[in-house]
């Protein structure tokens, strides 16, 4: 009889993570007696996969009834593949003997290579605000795909990105591996409802990508512009003196009136009205009483935005003037504003 | 049903011979290592042969040269040609099947008995 | 040859005890041992297998452990029908040889 011979027809098999993988093995003899063992890998370090003589292999299960003996077909599958399993997978052939069996042929080794989908992108911004005309950074991570191929893009509001940077891990082979890419992006007064996109496309996801998403409105932070007006009233010796607060983002916003220089009031930004490009304004008035000031009233409207150095802008009320020949009714967008009286 | 079933056995004088027959059925005997062992009665059991897949034979030093292990595939069976027969070859003749990877017995049969007599 | 020794020769116990029986070779034999259980007239019954593997159809009453020289076979709970005697034999290498076997009787 001829002497035995392991053969794996298979060099290598493919399978996708999650599913079951078919290692198929046979020899061409009944003879040396011994054990079939299943090994990843070769040399000392290999790895015991399934061993016909002993042990507990709860994810491997036989192709064939190994309780023929004239079964010659040694083939295995091997449960829920994850990238982890990928390797070469050796099926070996022993001696009985002792004091331990003796490898006597092995198969030339099936490489198994697992096909895992990358993890859903996610897409994080700058940890702090900035504001327009600054460019910032956005980075977008995916995780545990196999093979190592990926295609990686970035979008703003559908239009495709190219100041952007992109890394695979680790170089070499690998079980599996993760990408990071960092975009920039210029930020402009009009990104309140933008968008930044990362699209992943891989060979596992059938040309569906998966994509991340992140929204620049917890990124983008626009300074209000600010306008003091001076507005007649019907009552002879009062002036109505707004502050219109325009374009602003996010609603955080802290308003003080000084008088000559002295606190007033401060009042916090509440019914604020949402512009289309999601911006906010806000307006805020102070009724003042000509007739209890002898000489010119600086008024100044003082702004907090967000936790930022406060702006203001400052107006003159001439106390000889006529109130109802100053500035012009430009009060249409207050919505119930506090008004204060000076005496 | 996996069985063995010896026959074969019986009275023989000293220095003569005996033909002991096991007709294997349930599975293919040329797929299996089959031996022999014997039983002395009260005595414990002695492996006295056997055979491999591919032929090779094997024996306990006591019957070299006197016994011969042997098989007919198309009948499914297993024999032993026993020669110049002594007393101390007296004894129940199991037929044995080797077991799938490992040759441990696994299947026995209902034995056979030899007695060597004058 | 491997020379097999089991002990004790023999054995009394109860019903429902545990009882462990020990067998050695005189070389390393790896785990390639073999238990069998033999009623007097009748064929032997295999048991276990590579030392501690279970036949088909045995019941887990029966273990067995060991490697290399010293092996046990282990009866967790008597019963009546497991009153025979028992023999290891290794099967390493030829010839295959048994040990001189272990009588269990009833106390």
């Known amino acids: 009889e001829e002497e035995l011979q392991v053969i794996q027809p298979d060099k290598s098999v493919l399978v996708a993570a999650g599913e079951t993988a078919t290692l198929r093995c046979t020899a061409t003899s009944l003879i040396p007696v011994g054990p079939i063992q299943w090994f990843r890998g070769a040399g000392p370090g290999r790895e015991l996969i399934y061993n016909q003589k002993e042990g507990h292999f709860p994810r491997v299960t036989t192709v064939s009834d190994l309780t023929k003996r004239e079964n010659m077909d040694f083939s295995i599958r091997i449960g829920n593949i994850t990238p982890a399993d990928a390797g070469t997978y050796y099926c070996v052939k022993f001696r009985k003997g002792s004091p331990d069996d003796v490898e006597f042929k092995s198969g030339a080794g099936t490489e198994l290579s697992v096909r895992a989908k990358p993890s859903a992108p996610v897409v994080s911004g700058p940890a702090a605000r900035a504001t327009p005309q600054h460019t910032v950074s956005f980075t977008c991570e995916s995780h545990g795909f196999s093979p190592r191929d990926i295609t990686l893009k970035w979008f703003k509001n559908g239009n495709e990105l190219s100041d952007f940077q992109t890394n695979v891990d680790p170089v070499g082979e690998s079980v599996s591996y993760s990408i990071h890419s960092t975009a920039k992006v210029v930020l402009t007064r009009e990104d309140v409802h933008s968008q930044v996109i990362c699209e992943v496309a891989h060979v596992t996801l059938q040309g569906d990508p998966l994509r991340g998403t992140a929204n620049l409105s917890e990124t983008i932070r626009v300074p209000p512009t600010l306008e003091v007006t001076q507005q007649p009233v019907r009552a002879e010796n009062q002036v109505n003196v707004t502050c219109q607060v325009r374009k602003f983002y996010p609603q955080r916003l802290q308003l003080t009136w000084l008088e000559n220089g002295n606190v007033s009031r401060t009042e916090t930004a509440s019914t604020v009205t949402e512009n289309k490009d999601g911006t906010y304004n806000w307006m805020s008035w102070l009724l003042v009483n000509v007739s209890a000031h002898r000489d010119d009233v600086k008024l100044t409207c003082q702004v907090e935005h967000d936790g930022q150095p406060a702006v203001s802008k400052s107006h003159d009320l001439k106390v000889s003037a006529h109130p109802k020949e100053q500035g012009s009714n430009t009060a249409a967008e207050n919505t119930g504003s506090n008004e204060r009286n000076i005496y | 049903e996996v069985q063995l079933v010896e026959s074969g056995g019986g009275l023989v004088q000293p220095g003569g011979s005996l033909r002991l027959s096991c007709a294997a059925s349930?599975?293919?005997?040329?797929?299996?290592?089959m031996h022999w062992v014997r039983q002395a009665t009260g005595k414990g059991l002695e492996w006295v042969s056997a055979i491999g897949t591919a032929g090779d034979t094997y024996y306990t030093g006591s019957v070299k040269g006197r016994f011969t292990i042997s098989r007919e595939n198309a009948k499914n069976s297993l024999y032993l040609q026993m020669n110049s027969l002594r007393a101390a070859d007296t004894a129940v003749y199991y037929c044995?099947?080797?077991?799938?990877?490992?040759?441990?017995?696994?299947?026995w049969g209902q034995g056979t008995m030899v007695t060597v007599s004058s | 040859d491997i020379q097999m020794t089991q002990s004790p020769s023999s054995l009394s116990a109860s019903v429902g005890d545990r009882v462990t029986i020990t067998c050695r070779a005189s070389q390393d034999i790896n785990n390639y041992l073999a238990w069998f259980q033999q009623k007097p007239g009748k064929a032997p019954k295999s048991l276990i297998y590579?030392?501690?593997s279970l036949h088909s159809g045995v019941p887990s009453k029966f273990s067995g452990s060991g490697s290399g020289t010293d092996f046990t076979l282990t009866i967790s709970s008597l019963q009546p029908e497991d009153f025979a005697t028992y023999y290891c034999?290794?099967?390493?290498?030829?010839?295959?040889?048994f040990g001189q076997g272990t009588k269990l009787e009833i106390k």
């Open positions: 034999q290794q099967y390493v290498s030829y010839p295959y040889t």
């Open positions: 044995v099947r080797g077991g799938v990877w490992d040759d441990a017995f696994d299947i």
């Open positions: 590579t030392a501690s």
């Open positions: 349930g599975f293919t005997l040329s797929s299996y290592d």
